[in-house]
């Protein structure tokens, strides 16, 4: 028999001129049909076809419905479950190949199986609870997995009907939190850490870059407690900004003015120094406050010298040498 | 500033219940674990238990599992202790305290007494 | 359960001298994990709660005048008040938080 419609709860179909040989040319239709609220579950038991000829199920009872599968060729023994109460089987058999190539055929058991489609219930998880998606587990619906806190989610926490009815994932389970979250890093400092996931007994030491000051315990370690998850000992601590005493201010040297002119001036800032017209600068016409325990002048305070100074002692040494005699023994002497 | 505010004195009969509030206030209330502990002149210092208000995980001291109760409520930053089947022996002084693995800040006491 | 065992369980001293008093535990505090003593010392003056003076043994509470010292380790704890003052009147206890949480009977501080 190369077609027809099978109305029974369970039966075999079988290839054309089974267990002989079927023939070329062939394009055969069975038609399943079981009880409304029931599906069909197809094994597959032998599958020896040539490599031109197909076999296809539809999930359905006509050709337009979803296709379950298509096979050519061998393959070993199989299953297939439909999502309603009909399936339709085509095999074509290709009209070219010589009847010497052709294999033995095929023997499909049907069965009418209760209707399920949907994949078996997820169970509650210690210490956790789970989220679906939609109220029916039918394919496609996702299903999250959550921990109650102080406990966190081992394996995948999210779930999803697959095709075949099966869950994408195993079953997720919650565990004791036994570590610290990460305390994060502090602003202007570096950490060191002493282990990667701050297990219990870890700790991180936070240390400030220059020129801050820490505020805060500078090493947390992770305790844990007796009713709560894991905790750090102390909050994370903060870098501040090194409030440095100011320099006090330098008079402005004699015939000279110094710029600005402030009596507190902060570590980190300059002063200038100029002199009035017909006076030169000895000294350094810039000196900075250096930030420190306590601030301090980078160098002294400058002065102010007359222009013309250095001409008048250079001329007055030779007259020095000029002097008038006092007594003959000076005389004698020069 | 951190505080831990206790509910009244309470005198109840033997075989009653109680319960006892603690609300607290200067502090987030859920960063830190909420305990009991009661003072009498026979047995000193008696922890009862503590409950992480973050979780509601809770844990007692095995002398007094089934006769106590603790809960919270996140809104009010409130911690609660009830305690059952009272008997003369439990007459004390409760403190709800807050710590981890210290008891860094302690209520204002609330004294129970049971007597018919 | 871990048993606290302090001593004395009272003792009377004059302002200014050096008080000492112990606190012993059943079992050892030291957690190698945290390398901590899961120990704490408690003021309770009359007609007080409890204060925290000191905790991982030996580490003064913000506010605790530096008179008051904690030391010891593992199952032997001290804590030390260098120069006794009025206020210092108190009734001491220790207390662990290793395992659950248990306290000392206390050392009862009276002044001369």
């Known amino acids: 028999v190369c077609s027809g419609e099978i109305t029974d709860s369970a039966g075999v179909v079988l290839s054309p001129n089974w267990p002989e040989p079927y023939g070329r040319g062939q394009d055969c239709i069975w038609g399943v049909h079981v009880e409304e609220d029931k599906r069909i579950m197809l094994d597959i038991r032998v599958l020896r076809i040539g490599p031109g000829d197909v076999l296809t199920f539809y999930d359905g009872d006509d050709l337009t419905a979803r296709v379950l599968g298509q096979y050519s060729g061998p393959r070993s023994h199989f299953k297939l479950f439909t999502s309603m109460a009909d399936v339709t089987i085509q095999f074509q058999s290709d009209p070219g190949t010589s009847v010497l190539g052709y294999q033995q055929g095929f023997v499909i058991h049907f069965f009418e199986v209760p209707r399920n489609d949907t994949c078996p219930e997820l169970p509650e998880i210690p210490n956790g609870w789970k989220s679906p998606s939609q109220p029916e587990l039918v394919h496609g619906t996702v299903v999250t997995y959550q921990c109650y806190p102080g406990y966190q989610v081992v394996g995948s926490s999210v779930l999803m009907c697959q095709w075949d009815l099966t869950w994408s994932e195993d079953l997720p389970s919650c565990q004791r939190v036994t570590s610290c979250h990460d305390p994060g890093d502090v602003e202007h400092s570096r950490r060191l850490i002493s282990s990667p996931k701050f297990p219990v007994g870890a700790t991180v030491q936070y240390i400030c870059d220059q020129g801050f000051v820490l505020m805060g315990s500078s090493i947390l370690t992770c305790h844990d407690r007796q009713a709560g998850s894991p905790k750090w000992s102390d909050r994370a601590p903060k870098c501040l900004l090194e409030q440095l005493k100011p320099c006090h201010g330098l008079s402005a040297p004699e015939n000279g003015a110094r710029s600005p002119e402030k009596q507190l001036h902060p570590a980190g800032a300059t002063i200038h120094f100029s002199c009035a017209p017909g006076y030169v600068l000895k000294g350094q016409a810039s000196i900075k406050c250096v930030p420190g325990h306590p601030s301090h002048w980078s160098d002294p305070p400058p002065i102010c010298r007359a222009a013309s100074l250095d001409g008048f002692y250079n001329s007055r040494s030779l007259d020095v040498a000029k002097a008038p005699a006092a007594s003959s023994t000076l005389d004698a002497a020069h | 500033q951190v505080q831990l505010q206790q509910s009244g004195a309470e005198l109840v009969r033997p075989g009653a219940s109680v319960t006892l509030s603690c609300k607290a206030s200067?502090?987030?209330?859920?960063?830190?674990?909420m305990h009991w502990v009661r003072q009498t002149p026979v047995h000193g210092l008696e922890w009862i238990g503590g409950?992480?208000?973050?979780?509601?995980?809770?844990v007692y001291n095995q002398k007094f599992k089934g006769k106590v109760t603790l809960t919270e409520d996140k809104s009010s930053s409130t911690a609660y202790m009830e305690f059952r089947s009272l008997t003369s022996e439990d007459s004390a002084v409760y403190y709800c305290?807050?710590?981890?693995?210290?008891?860094?800040?302690w209520g204002t006491g609330t004294t129970v007494t049971v007597s018919s | 359960d871990i048993v606290m065992s302090q001593s004395p369980s009272s003792q009377a001293v004059s302002v200014g001298e050096k008080v000492t008093m112990t606190c012993k535990s059943s079992?050892?505090?030291?957690?190698?994990?945290?390398?901590?003593?899961?120990l704490a010392w408690y003021q309770q003056k009359p007609g007080q709660s409890p204060k925290l003076l000191i905790y991982?043994?030996?580490t003064r509470e913000s506010g605790v005048p530096d008179r008051f010292t904690g030391s010891g380790s593992g199952a032997d704890f001290t804590l030390t008040i260098s120069s006794v003052q009025a206020e210092d009147l108190a009734v001491y206890y220790c207390g662990q938080s290793y395992n659950l949480f248990t306290f000392g009977s206390g050392t009862k501080l009276e002044i001369k």
């Open positions: 991982w043994a030996s």
């Open positions: 409950i992480d208000p973050e979780s509601d995980n809770t």
């Open positions: 305290t807050r710590g981890d693995w210290y008891f860094d800040v």
């Open positions: 079992q050892s505090l030291l957690n190698s994990r945290t390398r901590e003593n899961y």
């Open positions: 200067g502090y987030t209330f859920t960063d830190y674990e």
